[in-house]
Interface confidence: medium
């Protein structure tokens, strides 16, 4: 008869470092002591007729245990395979590039240390929860890679590495370990340089706006902008609208920057840089300065007008170029009232880097003259009908403008410039006096008032009434006579005898 030696449990699965209770039993009635052969740490827990129980401790790796016993002089054996599973000690996703260009590939790398059995261990690379790659864990440490094409949607996306130890066939479930996620930052930086709008010339101590724009930038909000005039960094205001970035600054040139300079705009994103440069000439152009001997002179005074500009400039004064052509021009004049308010304009032209720069300055001359009262602006004789509406006009001229008063008998004023009803007391001779800091002039003005004569009016009215009454009566009598004649004629034609001619009532 053939006897068996059973080992229980059969082909167990346990976690690394665990312990296992093993029972060896035989149905051989005359068996000797049962032995357990294993490289693992073992301890006999109990034994009896045809059986023995052992405890295996600190089981770290897969192993085969063998029980043996002598039965009737023959050795019989039984075995069991122990499968040890262990979760990985380390699952690490390698750092991602600090910035990844959109449209270019990057490599995800995951390293897994430990984990058994390897045949049941899978490494999964993920973007969010999307599987990018699923590979078996091969070597120790297992190193798994996947190539990913970076897109705009990947900006800010978390990537991670997951291990799956599938012990489901052994009834133990799926053990998952996940690495710390790593966030990707993707970017688009166009190959074209920024558009830089800057002046070609900039005068010392003047300011001008500078604009730098770059389109097709992603994410525009993450870009760094550097704007500079020479080595002087400009304080830029950066705005982004969609994929367009605009930096605006004000460039102010200093005296020590005179000459050929560059305005630079750098846009940096993802460790890459795009640069635009524009040449700029910083120049100093003082003047032109217009000088009058005195800005305010009295009539008849000689005035010198001088114009002076940058030593390399060419000036024209009131349209007349300097003789010889150069940075200075002047003219002489005797001040007349017509020169009051006259502008003296000096234009200077300076050549800067092949370009002509123009500047102007204008000064006004004030000529003090007067006062004046002449016939044209202040007539000496006015004749107005009584009760009519009139506005007495008298304009005094001079600089400064004179104060004008017209008085009759030194007390009664003529209301200059005001509308008045002409009365007899307005009549008379007025003395008009114009006074300013430049002196005083007087002029006599006579006002005549025409009064109507009433007897002429009455005669005229009576005569008109008589004439009109006579004309009316004559017309009436003529018409009556005509009608009577017509009636008589009609009666005669009918054969009716005529009655004596009596006064008929008018029809």
């Amino acid at each position: 008869q053939e006897f068996l030696l059973r080992v229980e449990p059969q082909n167990p699965v346990l976690s690394a470092g665990g312990s296992l209770f093993v029972n060896c039993s035989t149905d051989c009635p005359s068996s000797e002591k049962i032995a357990l052969e294993t490289s693992l740490s073992k301890e006999l827990v109990a034994s009896g007729m045809g059986w023995a129980a052992f405890n295996l401790s600190n089981v770290t790796g897969n192993s085969r245990i063998l029980c043996s016993v002598y039965c009737n002089g023959s050795q019989i054996t039984g075995s069991s395979n122990i499968t040890v599973y262990g979760l990985p000690e380390r699952v690490e996703l390698a750092p991602l590039p600090p910035w990844q260009p959109v449209g270019q590939n990057f490599t995800l790398r995951c390293q897994v240390e430990g984990g058994s059995p390897r045949t049941s261990l899978t490494v999964v690379l993920l973007r969010w929860e999307e599987e990018l790659s699923r590979q078996p864990a091969v070597e120790e440490p297992a190193e798994v890679t996947a190539t990913v094409l970076a897109s705009r949607d990947d900006h800010g996306a978390p990537f991670s590495c997951r291990t799956e130890l599938d012990m489901q066939p052994q009834g133990l479930g799926l053990f998952v370990n996940t690495s710390a996620p790593r966030q990707l930052r993707t970017f688009v930086l166009p190959v074209t340089p920024p558009r830089l709008v800057a002046p070609r010339f900039l005068e010392v101590e003047t300011s001008w706006p500078v604009d730098c724009t770059l389109d097709g930038l992603f994410p525009a909000s993450e870009a760094q902008v550097y704007l500079a005039l020479g080595d002087q960094m400009l304080n830029a205001t950066v705005m982004n609208h969609g994929d367009t970035l605009t930096a605006t600054a004000t460039a102010t040139a200093r005296a020590d920057q005179e000459g050929a300079r560059e305005i630079v705009c750098n846009v940096t994103l993802g460790g890459e840089r795009r640069e635009a440069r524009e040449n700029l000439t910083v120049f100093s152009f003082l003047g032109p300065i217009v000088n009058l001997t005195k800005p305010e002179v009295s009539e008849g005074t000689e005035v010198t007008v001088k114009c002076e500009a940058h030593p390399r400039a060419k000036v024209t004064l009131n349209g007349v170029p300097a003789q010889p052509l150069g940075p200075r021009a002047q003219l002489l004049l005797k001040a007349t009232p017509e020169d009051n308010g006259r502008s003296f304009s000096c234009s200077a032209t300076l050549e800067v880097a092949g370009q002509l720069i123009h500047k102007n300055q204008t000064r006004e001359l004030r000529v003090l003259y007067g006062p004046r009262l002449d016939e044209r602006d202040c007539p000496g004789n006015w004749t107005w009908p009584e009760n009519s509406q009139q506005t007495p006009m008298c304009q005094a001229w001079g600089n400064p403008l004179p104060e004008l008063k017209c008085l009759k008998d030194g007390t009664f004023p003529l209301p200059i410039g005001e509308s008045v009803t002409v009365t007899r007391d307005l009549e008379g001779t007025y003395l008009c006096r114009a006074r300013s800091t430049q002196g005083e002039v007087t002029r006599k003005v006579t006002v005549n008032v025409l009064s109507p004569r009433y007897e002429i009016v009455i005669i005229t009215v009576v005569a008109a009434a008589v004439i009109m009454g006579t004309a009316g009566l004559s017309t009436y009598l003529y018409n009556r006579q005509r009608k009577i004649k017509k009636y008589r004629l009609q009666q005669a034609q009918k054969g009716t005898p005529m009655k004596p001619n009596t006064q008929a009532t008018p029809p």
Partner: antibody
Framework: EIQLQQTGPELVKPGASVKISCKAS????????ILWVKQSHGKGLEWIGK????????TYNLKFKGKATLTVDKSSSTAHMQLNSLTSEDSAVYYC????????????WGQGTSVTVSS | DAVMTQTPLSLPVSLGDQASISCRSS???????????LHWYLQKPGQSPQLLIY???NRFSGVPDRFSGSGSGTDFTLKLSRVEAEDLGVYFC?????????FGGGTKLEIK
Amino acid sequence: EIQLQQTGPELVKPGASVKISCKASGYSFTDCIILWVKQSHGKGLEWIGKINPYFGTTTYNLKFKGKATLTVDKSSSTAHMQLNSLTSEDSAVYYCARKEAYPDAMDYWGQGTSVTVSS
Amino acid sequence: DAVMTQTPLSLPVSLGDQASISCRSSQSLVHSNGDTYLHWYLQKPGQSPQLLIYKVSNRFSGVPDRFSGSGSGTDFTLKLSRVEAEDLGVYFCSQSTHVPYTFGGGTKLEIK
């Protein structure tokens, strides 16, 4: 063009050390694993070990553990192998080669560095 | 370690002939992931080894189609359909399924 350029021949005394370099070009250095192989007249080709330039992790053939030390300098895309306590048994031609991260084949090899250990 | 045994040690051929080299492993080269990491290299005189075939039967880029690989488990073969002068040198098989990676002793292909 993918290339692995090794340093020139070395003549060293017994007991000394030698450091061989392998400069990679034409590909992303951290994307592939660098392996080292010994070729001696008596024993043919022997695999010494490998290093992952990205992680810096190494795996050695137990026969060469303590004899060879593998390192990389990512900034210069160069792999190094230092051989210590040299004896005449270490006289050989040493090759560097590269392979993908998966256990694939060594697709590109350096030209080899001859090391002669002699007093 | 997986011991790789190549036969023959030397293979004299005439140009245009067919050639066959055998490689046997002391253990199966089938990885737990199902792939078999058995590769063939050629070392021409005075040069470094160069890859011909990877994972049993895949020709590396630039390798002529007169080279072919076959086999499974522990037995593998490299065949050359028509030997040319540039094919002369020492052929090695190698495995990377198990650590340490190991090489065969080499087969010298020479002109008769």
